[in-house]
Interface confidence: low
């Protein structure tokens, strides 16, 4: 008997106020600006016989709201006005008739910061659950898009680059993708959370930046990622050159990688040895190869020009002859910067600067 008497006290302590009305929800939730969150929530209320057939209406209000005067931020009551600033973004996703008060927030904005409480109404049974309240914290958007380049980029060969924001949520306003690149490009298909850019690189596009910018218009926030294009030409007689990564992390597959990033010092040393051996074998055939290369200059893609909106000088340097194998092996860094090996073609040696036009491509 004493235990039964204690139960209401335990309920009151753990679930606050009236033991007949209780609510379970996490007290704090953090969401990045522009993104979404679903907050699970369960509530309980007694049902008097005279309210058994009445519909259950649920409401989420901002802390401090006066029920008779202020609009809720979300409700399942169709004819109830909600706050203009949360309309369409805050949804009472749970079914209150099944004791579910789960709240969904999409396109989170800074102004959403604050505490919220739930209220239920069923006929004459009405109750505001003032404790626990849900505290919403909206933080900076730190996620960045991922750029995927399948395989290597070669001059004159089209490749599909994909910019994706897999971390964005399906329910939010679809983001706006913008691409910025010096290389000739056109837009490919897009899904809700990805955009494809078809790129046909030229030799002078090597080392230039390509940016994918994603704007979450629902919240007015933007995030972007920039990579450096690594345009590779695979000739009959290659030499190995080393190009550092952009230091922006390991999320995207980078262009111009020969069988992926060279991983591990052992593999690197082995490769260096092989290259030295190949170098001396190839050296004896250098003149013959050079003659062949001269005859292949017609493969140099033509460089058309668009509007000179943003011009940047880029120079493609011809390779320098070396008679030893000194310092050609890549090093493996332990920080975020990776080094990538690429192949340079001997026969291509443009004598003058080639201007690079940057174009911006947007997709809604």
């Amino acid at each position: 008997m004493p235990l039964l008497l204690l139960l209401p006290l335990l309920w009151a302590g753990a679930l606050a106020m009236d033991p007949n009305f209780w609510l379970q929800v996490q007290e704090s939730v953090t969401v990045q600006e522009g993104l979404c969150v679903l907050v699970p929530c369960t509530f309980f209320h007694p049902i008097p016989y005279y309210d058994k057939n009445s519909p259950v209406h649920g409401y989420w209000f901002r802390e401090g709201a006066i029920i008779s005067r202020d609009s809720p931020v979300a409700t399942n009551k169709l004819d109830q006005e909600v706050q203009e600033e949360t309309q369409g973004r805050f949804r009472l996703l749970g079914d209150p008739s099944r004791n579910n008060c789960s709240l969904s927030i999409v396109d989170a904005r800074r102004r959403d910061n604050g505490s919220y409480f739930f209220r239920m109404e069923r006929g004459s049974t009405k109750y505001s659950y003032k404790s626990p309240q849900l505290s919403v914290h909206v933080t900076d958007l730190t996620h960045r898009p991922k750029i995927l380049i399948p395989g290597t980029l070669e001059p004159g060969h089209s490749k599909n680059l994909t910019c994706s924001v897999s971390w964005a949520c399906e329910q939010g306003t679809p983001p706006i993708f913008s691409w910025l690149s010096a290389a000739p490009t056109s837009l490919g298909p897009r899904t809700t959370h990805s955009s494809v850019l078809i790129i046909t690189p030229r030799p002078q596009d090597h080392g230039t930046n390509l940016t994918c910018q994603v704007k979450f218009a629902g919240a007015g926030v933007t995030t972007e990622r920039t990579i450096q294009l690594n345009v590779t030409y695979v000739p009959q007689n290659p030499t190995t050159g080393i190009f550092p990564g952009d230091g922006s992390g390991k999320q995207e597959t980078r262009a111009g990688v020969v069988h992926g990033a060279i991983g591990g010092a052992g593999v690197t040393a082995l490769l260096a040895l092989c290259l030295c051996l190949i170098f001396f074998i190839v050296k004896t055939h250098r003149r013959k190869a050079a003659r062949t290369a001269v005859g292949r200059n017609d493969t140099h893609p033509t460089t058309g020009s668009a509007s000179p909106k943003h011009q940047k000088k880029s120079k493609l340097h011809g390779p320098t002859e070396t008679s030893s194998c000194s310092g050609a092996a890549p090093t493996v860094e332990m920080d975020e910067e990776l080094h990538y090996a690429s192949l340079n073609f001997h026969g291509m040696n443009p004598s003058k600067d080639t201007s690079t036009e940057y174009s911006e491509v947007r997709t809604q």
């Epitope: 709201a65 202020d70 609009s71 006005e81 706050q83 203009e84 600033e85």
Partner: nanobody, 120 residues
Framework: EVQLVESGGGEVQPGGSLRLSCAAS????????MGWFRQAPGKERELVAR????????EYAESVKGRFTISRDNAKNTLYLQMSSLRAEDTAVYYC?????????????WGQGTLVTVKP
């Protein structure tokens, strides 16, 4: 479309009080963030005060803090600005504005304005 009509302006002595009203008609009123702005002759328009749709949050210009109070009655579709301890520099045309647009950082709907003159 929302129509806003201001009233309550007039001439008052320094230290005096006035209460401006802004009646809204058209679409629903309760959801809007609303605000009072003013424009003195030869000066740029400035925000005086604004209030959230649920009456919870208010914001005031530094120059009017402690002297002006913004409030709203959603049932009457009316916005108010209670002005006390008026000064000569408060002389301006006062405008009521509704529905704050987050993308542009400005209000969408504006009233025609009501003139407030503070002079000895």
């Amino acid at each position: 479309e929302v129509q806003l009509v201001e009233s309550g302006g007039g001439e008052v002595q320094p230290g005096g009080s006035l209460r401006l009203s802004c009646a809204a008609s058209g679409r629903t009123f309760s959801g809007y963030i609303m605000g009072w702005f003013r424009q003195a002759p030869g000066k740029e328009r400035e925000l005086v005060a604004r209030i959230s749709g649920n009456n919870l949050a208010t914001e005031y210009a530094e120059s009017v803090k402690g002297r002006f109070t913004i409030s709203r009655d959603n049932a009457k579709n009316t916005l108010y600005l209670q002005m006390s301890s008026l000064r000569a520099e408060d002389t301006a045309v006062y405008y009521c504005a509704a529905e704050y647009d987050y993308s542009s950082g400005d209000f969408v709907y504006w009233g025609q304005g009501t003139l407030v003159t503070v002079k000895p």
